[in-house]
């Protein structure tokens, strides 16, 4: 039975040209995390494997930095970065947990962080 919950940074906004940290946190389970995938819609951004470390997709290498922890930092944001991002936690023995973050990249300086929320 999957008892864990994923907490994410929720709906967030940031300014064009700036950077943002995408974070998910898996709690309420003793399952071992074996890999975390970060995806934008159907595009793989990065993988963090417990045995092999980080792999950043070549097309994002210049503006994605791993961390902090299992999070991901997006740099030099453009309006095209607006959209859904997913953290996919592969765990043993529980299986897969998925969290969703919606990022809006704004032209102006009215970017504000959204509230945190939990996905059961």
């Amino acid at each position: 039975m999957m008892t864990g919950t994923i907490e994410t940074t929720g709906n967030i906004s940031a300014e064009k040209g700036g950077s943002i940290i995408l974070q998910c946190h898996l709690s309420s389970t003793t399952a071992q995390v074996t890999q975390v995938n970060w995806e934008q819609q159907d595009q793989l951004l990065a993988i963090c494997n417990a045995d092999l470390g980080w792999h950043i997709s070549p097309s994002f290498k210049d503006r994605v930095a791993p961390g902090p922890g299992l999070g991901l930092t997006l740099q030099s944001l453009t309006v095209n970065d607006t959209g859904e991002y997913f953290c996919i936690y592969h765990t043993y023995p529980d299986g897969t947990y998925t969290g969703r973050i919606f990022l809006e990249v704004l032209e102006s300086s009215v970017a504000e962080h959204g509230a945190r929320f939990q996905i059961p």
Partner: antibody, heavy 117, light 107 residues
Framework: EVQLQQSGTVLARPGASVKMSCKAS????????MHWVKQRPGQGLEWIGG????????NYNQKFKGKAKLTAVTSASTAYMELSSLTNEDSAVYYC??????????WGQGTSVTVSS | DVVLTQSPATLSVTPGDSVSLSCRAS??????LHWFQQKSHESPRLLIK???QSISGIPSRFSGSGSGTDFTLSINSVETEDFGMYFC?????????FGGGTKLEIK
């Protein structure tokens, strides 16, 4: 087998600069952060900063900005830390440690720096 | 910055005792808390990652718990080789920070 081999003991004068190294083996240096941690004699651990050799990203503890410079040469599987304008407060053991998202799981043996006139 | 406060500063125990070490964060850090052991003149060693996840090669008498701001490292039946310093560390946000440490000593 993963190993982090640090350069040897350093004795330096106040005002000087030192550059220490951390040679990684047994894994791909481009897939892990290399962090540097300071420990004064009888004291706790203090995070200086980290470098991600995969794309040369760095993160620093604000306290050490201007004091420490972190770099890495992927072809040599080696990370470096340069400390400048040394004072007695910089006398410490400095550790390198790797982190791939799952904790700082391997540590170097430490480099001892003594600043004395 | 996230401040980590460890207590007690020193813990005097007899081999065979079971002990709990505390680490408290100044703000919520979910489960992004790791525990290290450091013996005299040695490098730190990772004991527990992400509050409760075990590390290969670490004896099962070491366990961790907690989430949010309060975390505990438990040692079930302390052995003589366990005496030394214990540090907690957070990877929730930059800059990474360590707690001040707890010294586990023989009574």
């Amino acid at each position: 087998e993963v190993q982090l081999q640090q350069s040897g003991t350093v004795l330096a004068r106040p005002g000087a600069s030192v550059k220490m190294s951390c040679k990684a083996s047994g894994y791909s240096i481009t897939s892990y952060w290399m962090h540097w941690v300071k420990q004064r004699p009888g004291q706790g651990l203090e995070w200086i900063g980290g470098v991600y050799p995969g794309n040369s990203n760095t993160n620093y503890n604000q306290k050490f900005k201007g004091k420490a410079k972190l770099t890495a040469v992927t072809s040599a599987s080696t990370a470096y830390m340069e400390l400048s304008s040394l004072t007695n407060e910089d006398s410490a053991v400095y550790y390198c440690t790797r982190e791939g998202g799952y904790g700082m799981d391997y540590w170097g043996q430490g480099t001892s720096v003594t600043v004395s006139s | 910055d996230v401040v980590l406060t460890q207590s007690p500063a020193t813990l005097s125990v007899t081999p065979g005792d079971s002990v709990s070490l505390s680490c408290r964060a100044s703000q919520t850090i979910s489960n992004n808390l790791h525990w290290f052991q450091q013996k005299s003149h040695e490098s730190p060693r990772l004991l527990i990652k992400y509050s409760s996840q075990s590390i290969s090669g670490i004896p099962s008498r070491f366990s961790g718990s907690g989430s949010g701001t309060d975390f505990t490292l438990s040692i079930n039946s302390v052995e003589t080789e366990d005496f030394g310093m214990y540090f907690c560390q957070q990877s929730y946000s930059w800059p990474y920070t360590f707690g001040g440490g707890t010294k586990l000593e023989i009574k």
